[in-house]
């Protein structure tokens, strides 16, 4: 129950996440005009990865593309194959998520498909999450550099004359909502990796028949080499040869720490 | 240089519409409305995008201000309906050549002046 639970809050936080990524990869408010010493102004400029835009005290505001790819600053696109990168991520860990939850039954599904499913899953969202904090991040540090460098906005003045306005950006929302949203999906992907702790089976049971020796009674216990590798059930020195024949049902197996992970 | 006609100011009692018409000796990026009203500064109406059709309006017009273009005609309309005293001013039509903010509209009418009385 434990273990659904975690799986299925690790999906909805990964959720939230990701859904978080996008918004903020699309919005236009990475960095805003930096009002500080100028609270009162005509104009309000912000940027975002795909486009800038003004906003003028009527309310009024008019974004512009960046329509070109080679004149860009590399850092620019590094953030956005970041930003896009961590969606993708987290959209293809969301499918597999999907199929992965304890409470959805896919035909047949074994437990053990369904633990590296959600180990899959879980290790794309943090990586999606990751990818995300290291795009915003690296978008802030893009503008703390750049913050006394003022940037120079030309506009056009009537008849003709070119007005050159100092600005300098700053933080804008949607470099919140990217952390957050990134820490999100980080979280919910190590809820995932949890879960699939859980989730995964010690080992395969099948329905052995245990066979007699002529002088001691050996049981061959599937597995059993397992065991002497160290990954099976043996870790807790369980003994291996038994006196009477019985089907591998019969023993009981406990439940170990040393899961898939 | 493009030169900007304006028609259809007058007087015009409350609650009653008006409709302004400016159109453009050639094609521009966008097209426009602005307002003084006496003793103000000047005030964007709505405008609108020649090339995709977009508009805005200001919130003190929106539901009774409409604003559309005629390509073929590099004209621009300005529905009023419902007018208010406050609505009276001088209305300017406005054109840019490659943005429609105020700072960097490029040509402007001669003005039209709209009057809202009983």
């Known amino acids: 129950m434990a273990v659904t639970a975690c799986q299925g809050l690790g999906f909805v936080v990964s959720l939230i996440g990701i859904a978080g990524i996008i918004a903020a990869t699309c919005m236009d408010q990475w960095s805003t005009q930096d009002l500080y010493n100028n609270p009162v102004t005509a104009v309000f400029n912000y940027q975002g990865l795909w486009r800038s835009c003004v906003r003028e005290s009527s309310g009024f505001t008019e974004c512009r593309g960046y329509f070109t790819l080679l004149g860009l600053p590399a850092m620019l696109q590094a953030v956005r194959a970041l930003m896009i990168v961590g969606i993708v991520l987290g959209a293809i860990g969301l499918l597999v998520s999907i199929f992965a939850l304890k409470c959805i039954r896919i035909g047949s599904m074994e437990d053990s498909a369904k633990a590296n499913m959600t180990l899959t899953s879980g290790i794309m969202f943090i990586v999606s999450g990751l990818c995300a904090i290291a795009g915003v991040s690296v978008f802030a540090n893009m503008l703390v550099t750049n913050f006394w460098m003022s940037t120079a906005n030309m506009y056009t003045g009537m008849g003709g004359m070119v007005q050159t306005v100092q600005t300098r950006y700053t933080f804008g929302a949607a470099l919140f909502v990217g952390w957050v949203a990134g820490g999100l999906t980080l979280i919910g992907g190590v809820m995932m990796c949890i879960a699939c702790r859980g989730l995964a089976p010690e080992e395969t049971n099948y329905k052995a028949v245990s066979y007699h020796a002529s002088g001691h009674s050996v049981a061959y216990k599937p597995g059993g080499f397992k065991a002497s590798t160290g990954f099976g059930s043996n870790t807790k020195n369980k003994k291996i040869y038994d006196g009477g024949a019985r089907t591998e049902d019969e023993v009981q197996s406990y439940p170990s720490k040393h899961d898939y992970v | 240089e493009v030169q900007l006609l304006e028609s259809g100011g007058g007087l015009v009692q409350p609650g009653g519409s008006l409709r302004l018409s400016c159109a453009a000796s050639?094609?521009?990026?966008?097209m426009g409305w602005f307002r003084q009203a006496p003793g103000k500064g000047l005030e964007r109406v709505a405008n609108?995008?020649?090339?995709?059709?977009?508009?805005w309006l200001a919130d003190s017009v929106k539901g009774r201000f409409t604003i559309s273009r005629d390509n073929s005609k590099n004209a621009v309309y300005l529905q009023m309906n419902s007018l208010r005293a406050e609505d009276t001013a001088v209305y300017y039509c406005?054109?840019?050549?490659?943005?429609?903010?105020?700072?960097?509209?490029?040509?402007w009418g001669q003005g039209t002046l709209v009057t809202v009385s009983s």
């Open positions: 609108v995008y020649m090339r995709n059709g977009d508009t």
């Open positions: 406005a054109a840019g050549r490659s943005s429609c903010l105020e700072a960097s509209i490029s040509y």
């Open positions: 050639r094609s521009t990026y966008c």
